[in-house]
């Protein structure tokens, strides 16, 4: 962890600051094991929710989580954690896991005759237990979505219940 938090003589630009972490901030992950949905931030000295960096870069430490997050946003797909891939429900109906139930069963019962609000509910069933940030609805909104998770300390709803397709 040399260089972190240590000052040097002379001015330092942001470029210099980034040179202190040549492969990016997250090379320090090996120093700490964080839950799968989190990464170690060596400047904050704590594990942070991967959700906070999914839009910015695909770091190895958060790659699987960020893929699963974007996969869940696609209708008719689910994230297979064993294959580490986004799978189309259409290709496995008949032998489908529960994550595809809404899709495969709706294929059998065409939703054309359903009222629009029911149609939306059915097609969005996988997302229904969470808001856009992946936080379970019904849980009290505790702090911001980026809230750090020091094991044994307070947990935001993100850390308590990050929506994972299992």
């Amino acid at each position: 962890m040399s260089g972190l938090g240590r000052s040097r003589r002379g001015g330092r630009s942001r470029v210099d600051q980034e040179e202190r972490f040549p492969q990016g901030l997250w090379t320090g992950v090996a120093m700490r094991s964080c839950p799968e949905e989190q990464y170690w931030d060596p400047l904050l000295g704590t594990c942070m929710s991967c959700k906070t960096i999914c839009n910015h870069q695909s770091q190895r430490t958060c790659a699987a989580f960020c893929r699963s997050l974007s996969c869940r946003k696609e209708q008719g797909k689910f994230y297979d954690h064993l294959l580490r891939d986004c799978i189309s429900c259409a290709s496995i109906c008949g032998q489908h896991p529960k994550q595809c139930a809404y899709f495969c069963e709706n294929k059998l019962r065409s939703p054309v005759n359903l009222p629009p609000e029911l149609r939306r509910q059915r097609s969005g069933e996988v997302e229904n237990n969470s808001d856009n940030s992946g936080r379970y609805q019904g849980l009290e909104h505790r702090g911001s979505e980026a809230s750090p998770a020091l094991p044994g300390l307070k947990l935001s709803a993100d850390q308590v219940a990050l929506v994972y397709s299992t």
Partner: antibody
Framework: EVQLQQSVAELVRPGASVKLSCTAS????????IHWVKQRPEQGLEWIGK????????EYAPKFQGKATITADTSSNTAYLQLSSLTSEDTTIYYC???????WGQGTTLTVSS | DIVLSQSPSSLAVSIGEKVTLSCKSS????????????LAWFQQKPGQSLKLLIY???TREFGVPDRFTGSGSGTDFTLTISSVKTEDLAVYYC???????FGGGTKLEIK
């Protein structure tokens, strides 16, 4: 409940050394860093240094290099700040804080006087 | 070293007033890889230790009232208190996480 507990006050003779303690409860110090900060009315807040209790690595602000030594005992969940060759300049409040500054001890008032 | 300059050094306000505190850094605090600004805001009341209000320049810490808002990027940062309450009277410090330096503080007083 998460807390960082510090001794309230220390009175030490000039030239001597002192070891201030910071005991964490409610979390394991191995999961974060522990920083030490000095606060003097005229100088404001000065970062002394930090320790990574998981591996014992410590880092210091240049000003405190040689003056301060930060250690940690994970078995007692405690971090320490040792200050050597004390002078009146060292008379002030010292805080310990966790990780990104979410939790702070109540501060130890150090008085260096003969 | 990274120098943080806070202004004003003190500010007399009326209860219910909107307050804006400034913090300028001698170098950019934006880490481009994750687009986070490594700047925090702390509150210190007389005889007490510091309380974290904001980190990553704009992320409110757990339990902090939403009248406190952090904004800015790069070198210019602001802490806004939308409607000052009596309990907000304190000294406010900005701090950067690269080398852990603090600003000189802004003292918020009653007018």
């Amino acid at each position: 409940e998460v807390q960082l507990q510090q001794s309230v006050a220390e009175l030490v003779r000039p030239g001597a050394s002192v070891k201030l303690s910071c005991t964490a409860s409610g979390f394991n110090i191995k999961n974060t860093y522990i920083h030490w900060v000095k606060q003097r009315p005229e100088q404001g807040l000065e970062w002394i240094g930090k320790i990574d209790p998981a591996n014992g690595n410590s880092e210091y602000a240049p000003k405190f290099q040689g003056k301060a030594t930060i250690t940690a005992d994970t078995s007692s969940n405690t971090a320490y700040l040792q200050l050597s060759s004390l002078t009146s300049e060292d008379t002030t409040i010292y805080y310990c804080t966790s990780g990104y500054g979410a939790y702070w001890g109540q501060g130890t008032t150090l008085t260096v006087s003969s | 070293d990274i120098v943080l300059s806070q202004s004003p050094s003190s500010l007399a306000v009326s209860i219910g007033e909107k307050v804006t505190l400034s913090c300028k850094s001698s170098q950019s605090l934006l880490y481009s890889s994750n687009q986070k600004n490594y700047l925090a805001w702390f509150q210190q009341k007389p005889g007490q230790s510091l309380k974290l209000l904001i980190y990553w320049a704009s992320t409110r810490e757990f339990g902090v009232p939403d009248r406190f808002t952090g904004s800015g990027s790069g070198t210019d940062f602001t802490l806004t208190i939308s409607s000052v309450k009596t309990e907000d009277l304190a000294v406010y410090y900005c701090q950067q996480y690269y080398t852990w330096t603090f600003g000189g503080g802004t003292k918020l007083e009653i007018k």
